[in-house]
Structure formats: structure tokens, C-alpha cells
């Protein structure tokens, strides 16, 4: 088995490689992986106590 690079830091690492649409680049493992979609709900009406939390959609298999 091949090891991912250990010593690379974010600022030194090569730019993420293009991934297919259902994937994104994971800096941790330095490779494309399956990815879900992030979504940000519409803001709450004025006067609401706090902004709506950002949430996510599960990755598709």
C-alpha cells in the first residue's frame, strides 16, 4: 500500500486536482473522495434570535 504524503502542509501542498462531479478533493488524504452538497438555509426573518445554522446533504453512494 502506498502512503499519502505526510510532511505536506496546506500552504506547501500541490493544488487540488480536478475531481469528477460527485467528488471533491480531501486535503487530509490528498485525493478525490465522494462528496455531498453543502447548503445554507435562507436567513431567518428579521428579529430572529440567531442565524439559521449551515447544514449539509449526505454524500450519494
Amino acid at each position: 500500500m502506498r502512503r499519502g504524503p505526510r510532511s505536506l502542509r496546506g500552504r506547501d501542498a500541490p493544488a487540488p486536482t480536478p475531481c469528477v462531479p460527485a467528488e471533491c478533493f480531501d486535503l487530509l488524504v490528498r485525493h478525490c473522495v465522494a462528496c455531498g452538497l453543502l447548503r445554507t438555509p435562507r436567513p431567518k426573518p428579521a428579529g430572529a434570535s440567531s442565524p439559521a445554522p449551515r447544514t449539509a446533504l449526505q454524500p450519494q453512494e
Epitope: M1, R2, R3, G4, R6, L8, R9, G10, R11, A13, P16, C19, C24, F25, D26, L27, L28, V29, R30, H31, V33, A34, C35, G36, L37, L38, R54, A56, L57, Q58, P59, E61
Partner: antibody
Framework: EVQLVESGGGLVQPGGSLRLSCAAS????????IHWVRQAPGKGLEWVAW????????DYADSVKGRFTISADTSKNTAYLQMNSLRAEDTAVYYC??????????????????WGQGTLVTVSS | DIQMTQSPSSLSASVGDRVTITCRAS??????VAWYQQKPGKAPKLLIF???YLFSGVPSRFSGSGSGTDFTLTISSLQPEDFATYYC?????????FGQGTKVEIK
Amino acid sequence: EVQLVESGGGLVQPGGSLRLSCAASGFTISSSSIHWVRQAPGKGLEWVAWVLPSVGFTDYADSVKGRFTISADTSKNTAYLQMNSLRAEDTAVYYCARRVCYNRLGVCAGGMDYWGQGTLVTVSS
Amino acid sequence: DIQMTQSPSSLSASVGDRVTITCRASEDISSAVAWYQQKPGKAPKLLIFAASYLFSGVPSRFSGSGSGTDFTLTISSLQPEDFATYYCQQSQVSPPTFGQGTKVEIK
């Protein structure tokens, strides 16, 4: 339903070996990275190793490097942790976990979303 | 390796209190931080990822903020089921590292 089930823990003497298994269901392990995290009695979480089954990439904590080997069998949808030259300080509950990723500007934003129940490894003479 | 320093290591609070836990990274990790909750004898549960995104099914009283080196987990109104230990973790670069944990106890 996504599920991870660890097995293979037990009592072993110092210098001995154990092989832990992490059987996944409800998703395919080739789509994400699988991690082993341990927790010594009364202590915090310590990351041990990860494997990216789709390409075979791996990485290890310095404390286990050269003694532990992580691997995966995609046909069995199972990840493994081979532990050799075990020491008393390896005594812990070992969890396997899946790293989930969400696409933020083409880059993964994520965390470990599903964890197994844990398996206890005790290294003692 | 990137070190994650959590504070405080423990705190006592009452139901309804606002609780804040901080985590400091030894170098810039952008927003690559997750927060977990763990109860005795149980596996950790993911609460927050990417510093501020609430994971599916997690109550909205939990929130996260921060970027660079300083991060915060806030529980807006502590509930009885929230008494647990909380951990931060960075995933900007391998090896991923955890903070030492913050135990939230009943006052």
C-alpha cells in the same frame, strides 16, 4: 443504514499481535477514508491511522508507525488494523470511523460521521 | 504535527447556561475543524464540521465559529443530555489531531 462494527480485540501479552476488523454496511468503503481512533482508559481520543481504500493511501500516528498496519478489503467492505509489537500503552478502546466529506468550492469539508461501538484491546502480562 | 489545545479542560454549568469551549491550533488550519460529543462508554458523535456547519440531526443550540487558529463551540442553552466531553479535531493536514477534551459537568 450506515453501520461500522469492530471486532478482534482482547487480552494480549506485551510484544504480541492482534488484528482488528471494521465491517462496514450501508455504504461502500471505497467512497471515503476509514480511520482508527483509540481511547486509553480515562483519557482522550487519539487518532491512530487512516486508509483510503480506493487507492490504498495510508497514514499513521508516530506512536504506532512501524508496528501497526492499516488495510482494507473492498470486496468484503472491511478495514483492518494489524497491531504488532504491542505495548502496555496501546491498551485502549479502538474505534473505527468513516470520514464524510461535503463539497465546499471543490474541497472536502467534513468530519467522522459514523463510528463503531469500539473494541477493547488490553496489553498486559 | 499540528497541535490542538482545548480550554477549559473541564467546566461546571447548569441547565440553561450558555457554554463556550475554545480550541487553538498551533498553525493556520483554515476552517478544517470538527467538534465531537462523547458520553461515557459510548463512541463520539459528530456535532460540527468545517468549523461552523451543523451536522445532520444535531440540535441548533450547538454552533461553531472561527477560522485560522482559533475556534469556538457554543451551546446556547445547556440541556441535561449535553453533559458530556467535547473534542475538537483538525483535518487540514495529516495526521489529524484531537484536542485533549473538555468535560462539561453539572454544577
